[in-house]
Interface confidence: low
Amino acid sequence: GYKAEVMVSQVYSGSLRVLNRHFSQDLTRRESSAFRSETAKAQKMLKELITSTRLGTYYNSSSVYSFGEGPLTCFFWFILQIPEHRRLMLSPEVVQALLVEELLSTVNSSAAVPYRAEYEVDPEGLVILEASVKDIAALNSTLGCYRYSYVGQGQVLRLKGPDHLASSCLWHLQGPKDLMLKLRLEWTLAECRDRLAMYDVAGPLEKRLITSVYGCSRQEPVVEVLASGAIMAVVWKKGLHSYYDPFVLSVQPVVFQACEVNLTLDNRLDSQGVLSTPYFPSYYSPQTHCSWHLTVPSLDYGLALWFDAYALRRQKYDLPCTQGQWTIQNRRLCGLRILQPYAERIPVVATAGITINFTSQISLTGPGVRVHYGLYNQSDPCPGEFLCSVNGLCVPACDGVKDCPNGLDERNCVCRATFQCKEDSTCISLPKVCDGQPDCLNGSDEEQCQEGVPCGTFTFQCEDRSCVKKPNPQCDGRPDCRDGSDEEHCDCGLQGPSSRIVGGAVSSEGEWPWQASLQVRGRHICGGALIADRWVITAAHCFQEDSMASTVLWTVFLGKVWQNSRWPGEVSFKVSRLLLHPYHEEDSHDYDVALLQLDHPVVRSAAVRPVCLPARSHFFEPGLHCWITGWGALREGGPISNALQKVDVQLIPQDLCSEVYRYQVTPRMLCAGYRKGKKDACQGDSGGPLVCKALSGRWFLAGLVSWGLGCGRPNYFGVYTRITGVISWIQQVVT
């Protein structure tokens, strides 16, 4: 029998330019008679134009929903009912070509053409895009709160906030032709549930979404987004009811920035410069294309690209790259945002140089990408260290910590976390190196102790970048570096004179003068440690809840011992800045560290002084007994302690702890405690210091209380943020 043809709805969205009409402000108000009258005429014209072509057979409906500058631009959508088998034949490009052909055929015609009765439509200004029924529904839901804004060159326009009676609003933004729009979003509240979506076209077309942001993001308090051209739409969806705008939006037109560079690198190792997407740190725009050509001075060198929170991965099955496509020496790689550092190492085999291309393959974009570039020695990429092939980074080898995700930096070690004697490859513990006592057969542990040595895992790097063999030489009263830098910044780590209770668990005043109590509305929440005159370090997870993210909530107490009373040595501070480690990941507890800048510098006293910070190479030997302090609960699930408690814990080898916690322990973590449990940190101790005493009598910060299974349970150690794993970030912030 006869089978009726299956018809499908195909939705198109677009804009056209009218040359004999001019835009006026009346046309931005949907309730105005000017808008109603212009819409009726434009609607009629659009329908007549479509039905004048062979698309007329399929015409279903259409709507002009907005106007803009140019002299007058009409924004519209229409639906065609198409036989299913012809669906692919009527792509937006084909439909646009048919309509343009129709317009061109009547440009010089003297015959009366219905759609030309009122309007002179510019064939070159017609744009047709693919849309969906869902897109039209999304558009219609915003029309009760629709704002059109034109922003001129050199202007920065602050957009009027949303209408709080509406559940959704749309800002339709337009700038001068040949420029691109840059939108700035700044979240102004600590907590909200609002959603904002930015599109690379005039309306909310899902396929042209640039990015969407949600709920007063603390990770990105300010977001700058670039469109590929002079048109953009921003859609707001209401979260919790609020009379205050949780965000500020502003927009400005900017010129296209070329993203092409030819560079010749110098004959030296390490970073030599930075490449970045246009307007970094703005999100890169759809249709970004960067091409960087780098020439290497000799085939001895390879090219290294160091990324921050971004990695390159091979993409399977030729799927599009959703976070940026890279081509490097004909290899196609996809960008991937990660909470880790990463390096791409490119072996150089020809003097012609290397071309690196970056392209945004889809309209969905992301934070701008910045990469440091430099050279590495192809025959020895990581002098004194191990090249981790998984992430391209140089990591310490054989230090007892699997820094490389595949653990190969700890494989095939003759001496793990110990010193290897030259004579017979016996291993001696690191504190025995350069201690004045020969321990190796021919005394190789005491050689080269007064001179510079090649830098390695356990060598200390002086300020002049030379290295010394003696482990942990900082602040021991003897200058080991030629420039004396190992004895600088040593006003730290000394306890105040205290009448300590021998063997007692309660600390006395001045015993731990770096200990901080971080409080919200008079309630102790977390511990912390003073590390500089205006900086306290703590755990990032203390600020995990949105309600705890605002600096105004927090008060920092130093010199405190008892929670329920004050004594003269105690001082308090407000917080002027709160910085979480950029790689902090709540789920895994990785990089669990935060820095608080105090509102004024501390005045040092017997009860208030900073702890010493270790160098990256500082070795805290497993088995060493160290101390944790805090006002945390005295038993699992119990209330916090009134008195500052102290407890000794033993540092645990990383592999043992990793096994116990089923490999959830990262290189930025350190474990301490006892197999039998009992001595441990607990709730309320978070962020507090784990300190170890050096032979010099100074206390060094080894860790911050981070996480663990329960408190003091047998077989489960406490897990601490490893300070040596995050020290470079700390120093970068504090200095």
Epitope: V390, P405, N406, G407, R411, S658, E659, V660, Y663
Partner: antibody
């Protein structure tokens, strides 16, 4: 309830190829390394290969290196073992096993699939 | 010939205690954790002990593991007929870059 189900076993002639599959359910597949372990009839266990949770690395026992390829499709919760140039001594029950990330603790095993290489 | 050496069989009366040994070298047991697996007749292996002495949830505390130097052992107390099975030790071997198993020990409950 974690379940691993192997399939693809059978009788095959020496020199030919076979592809084994293992489908996981009740588990966050992407968080774990996956291994193949085999057991020759009436004999002990022999580890064959591992693939890291994120597909970044795979290792093989010397006896299968260059002939077998382990792969996974995290979107399908599936693990595969492509076996080429099969030999009579590859005859075994092949088990897929879930490994703790970066470790070799096999906490869940499939029921096994028998591969017989015979002319 | 297995890299890790286990006795081929052991037997003991019900309610008694039995120990199964597993001997290796510095490149496997000496440097890495040992895991034990139980394989009941006609079934797939099951994890019994991980990391030398850790008991996975759901495994009876009649089973215990220990390690000293390059040897490990599995002890089963209060023997039951349901414990009749093959027991395998396993460890990573640094020089082979592979997981190595013992040849297996058949436990008979008399």
């Amino acid at each position: 309830q974690v379940q691993l189900v192997e399939s693809g076993g059978g009788v095959v002639q020496p020199g030919r190829s076979l592809r084994l599959s293992c489908t996981a359910s009740g588990v966050t597949f992407t968080n774990f390394d996956m291994h193949w372990v085999r057991q020759t009839p009436g004999k002990g266990l022999e580890w064959v290969a591992v693939i890291w949770y994120d597909e970044s690395y795979s290792y093989y026992a010397d006896s299968v290196q260059g002939r077998f390829t382990i792969s996974r499709d995290n979107s399908k919760n599936s693990l595969y073992l492509q076996m080429n140039s099969l030999r009579a001594d590859d005859t075994a029950v092949y088990y897929c096993a879930r490994g703790w990330t970066g470790s070799y603790v096999f906490d869940y095993w499939g029921q096994g699939t028998l591969v017989t290489v015979s002319s | 010939q297995s890299v890790l050496t286990q006795p081929p069989s052991v037997s003991e009366a019900p309610r008694q205690r039995v120990t199964i040994s597993c001997s290796g070298s510095s490149s496997n047991i000496g440097n890495n954790a040992v895991n034990w697996y139980q394989q009941l007749p006609g079934k797939a292996p099951k994890l019994l002990i991980s990391y030398d002495d850790l008991l996975p949830s759901g495994v009876s505390d009649r089973f215990s593991g220990s390690k000293s130097g390059t040897s490990a052992s599995l002890a089963i107390s209060g023997l039951q007929s349901a414990d009749e099975a093959d027991y395998y030790c396993a460890a990573w071997d640094d020089s082979l870059n592979a997981v190595v198993f013992g040849g297996g020990t058949k436990l008979t409950v008399l």
